[in-house]
Interface confidence: low
Amino acid sequence: SKWVFEHPETLYAWEGACVWIPCTYRALDGDLESFILFHNPEYNKNTSKFDGTRLYESTKDGKVPSEQKRVQFLGDKNKNCTLSIHPVHLNDSGQLGLRMESKTEKWMERIHLNVSERPFPPHIQLPPEIQESQEVTLTCLLNFSCYGYPIQLQWLLEGVPMRQAAVTSTSLTIKSVFTRSELKFSPQWSHHGKIVTCQLQDADGKFLSNDTVQLNVKHPPKKVTTVIQNPMPIREGDTVTLSCNYNSSNPSVTRYEWKPHGAWEEPSLGVLKIQNVGWDNTTIACAACNSWCSWASPVALNVQYAPRDVRVRKIKPLSEIHSGNSVSLQCDFSSSHPKEVQFFWEKNGRLLGKESQLNFDSISPEDAGSYSCWVNNSIGQTASKAWTLEVLYAPRRLRVSMSPGDQVMEGKSATLTCESDANPPVSHYTWFDWNNQSLPYHSQKLRLEPVKVQHSGAYWCQGTNSVGKGRSPLSTLTVYYSPETIGRR
């Protein structure tokens, strides 16, 4: 058969503070008649009584003395055994013995009191893992609460009060005595490694004690940047080295990714080597990865290269070129970096001009030929393929040549050839005699065989192509008599 008591097993306080001991009981019989509070009670077998310092002794009727005393019994005669010690002293540490007597029964209930010289620190409880931007609750727990000694728990981050509203709760129950402050907090990556302090203060804000923890905030790599290590500018064909840098990462970075993907060398972690960099390698981005990957903004390689795809393009006229036309040739290229370029036109190794266009006000057949243009920038120069300029013109420089000569003996053979310069070549010949009578011959050669004296005279030819016609000057053929004819005469 026991008396039933409920109260915290041990209470904690410090010199100058107070203790409030919530306590309930149920006596075995009737009401309480006597109550004595002992400090470190010891049972004396000789006297069958308890010895020890008496902190409080009730009067026989169980009434509480009205005057304020350091130790107060705030209970009653049947169920409440709450106690208050204010102020509490270091030497109050030890056992408190509640000696309860009813009419017929007695009981000694022991409660442990732990009084420290200085205010003991609270204890910060953190979740097992903290991730950035995920709200967590920081808990600061102090195994102390007392009505007569208001305290406050203040949160500091790196020594500066945290502005988030903390919820402070106190428990002064038979189950537990504590003060707890809970702070809902969304940590940022920049809080990683920072010191959070829970500071115990008295009602006036005076520092009493504290507990500190270092925040371990899991976060992806932060402020990731792709850095070009090469001196600028980068030229096509150079070997380019890039590094992937970051400001903070928790856990540590274990790998890196690069885009676009290429058959590139990674000589060390976070370093990329691009050999023989292409002119079209525009941007590169890297990611630093721990449990997460964080991508940097792409960095422009800004590769410089000689002009590309240089070609000659006829821009005027749109159709074929006829002698006398105005002609414009354009030196085109697809791209160049740097953009500033120079042009050079060349025909048969001879420099013709330094503009992007080559212009002929009135083209002549002599301008026909193989043309090239060159485009150069500070990186290099690029030549076009040779481009053939073809000039179409009517037959010109026509002449009649005679074989074997312009004096032929009758009976022999004489061949008249219409020689000309034309583009396209002469497609049709017409022969005329000294009377401007057209002859029934339309090939380039007019063969007279056997030649007669009557054939003597001036001949001319006309050549025709798709562009036009041209005529030769007169050429005279002299046919003389043979010795036989002269002999007959």
Epitope: P150, Q152, Q154, V160, P161, R163, A165, A166, V167, T168, Q201, A203, D204, G205
Partner: antibody, heavy 120, light 112 residues
């Protein structure tokens, strides 16, 4: 003991700005909010805003945003309030007041007030 | 903004009388942390204000016990059990629970 020493009276022209000060002593300046209050004769009192000198954080009454700018200099334990584009309605006594407790929040110590008169 | 309405505007009293000042807020001034930051200040002519009561009913240190505060939610009262000459001046209620903080219009306690 805790004291707040405010700067002397100011006579300023309309459209001008004025900067008044409040020097704190007797406590850790950076650890208490400093509030500013406006009092016009017969008009009651208005809370302007507050500053936390520890990190310069501020809260303003919407009515005084753009009108008042609160700053603090930890090295000299001095809080400042600058009032801009002054008009006659800005003529008032301005008090600084400390939030005395981070537990109970009350204005336990006040400055003596600075009189600002706006007149051409 | 929370409007703090004080009544009466003027309160003529005889020394030794009980005085009661009412302060009503336009909405609840219970702070999210559960506290009600309602304060009472006394301002005497030519002086800066003095704190009397904080958190509705707590007397500030050095304030005589003839001053008491009560109320909850939106209705609050300051009582002076026996008015003394040094109690004359303008009394202001103040809410520090929600931004912007606001004062009541003031009640002038003067001799009849």
């Amino acid at each position: 003991q805790v004291q707040l020493q405010q700067s002397g009276p100011e006579l300023v022209k309309p459209g001008a700005s004025v900067k008044i000060s409040c020097k704190a002593s007797g406590y850790e300046f950076s650890r208490s909010w400093m509030n500013w209050v406006k009092q016009r004769p017969g008009q009651g009192r208005e809370w302007i805003g507050r500053i936390y000198p520890g990190d310069g954080d501020t809260n303003y009454s919407g009515k005084f945003k753009g009108k008042a700018t609160l700053t603090a200099d930890k090295s000299s334990s001095t809080a400042y309030m600058q009032l801009s584009s002054l008009t006659s309605v800005d003529s008032a006594v301005y008090f600084c007041a400390r939030d005395g407790s981070s537990w109970d929040w009350y204005f336990d110590v006040w400055g003596a007030g600075t009189t600002v008169t706006v007149s051409s | 903004d929370i409007l703090m309405t004080q009544t009466p505007l003027s309160l003529p009293v005889s020394l030794g009388d009980q005085a009661s000042i009412s302060c009503r807020s336009s909405q609840s001034i219970v702070h999210s942390n559960g506290n009600t930051f309602l304060e009472w200040y006394l301002q005497k002519p030519g002086q800066s204000p003095k704190l009397l009561i904080y958190k509705v009913s707590n007397r500030f240190s050095g304030v005589p016990d003839r001053f008491s505060g009560s109320g909850s939610g939106t209705d609050f009262t300051l009582k002076i059990s026996r008015v003394e000459a040094e109690d004359l001046g303008v009394y202001y209620c103040f809410q520090g629970s929600q931004f912007p903080y606001t004062f009541g219009g003031g009640t002038k306690v003067e001799i009849k």
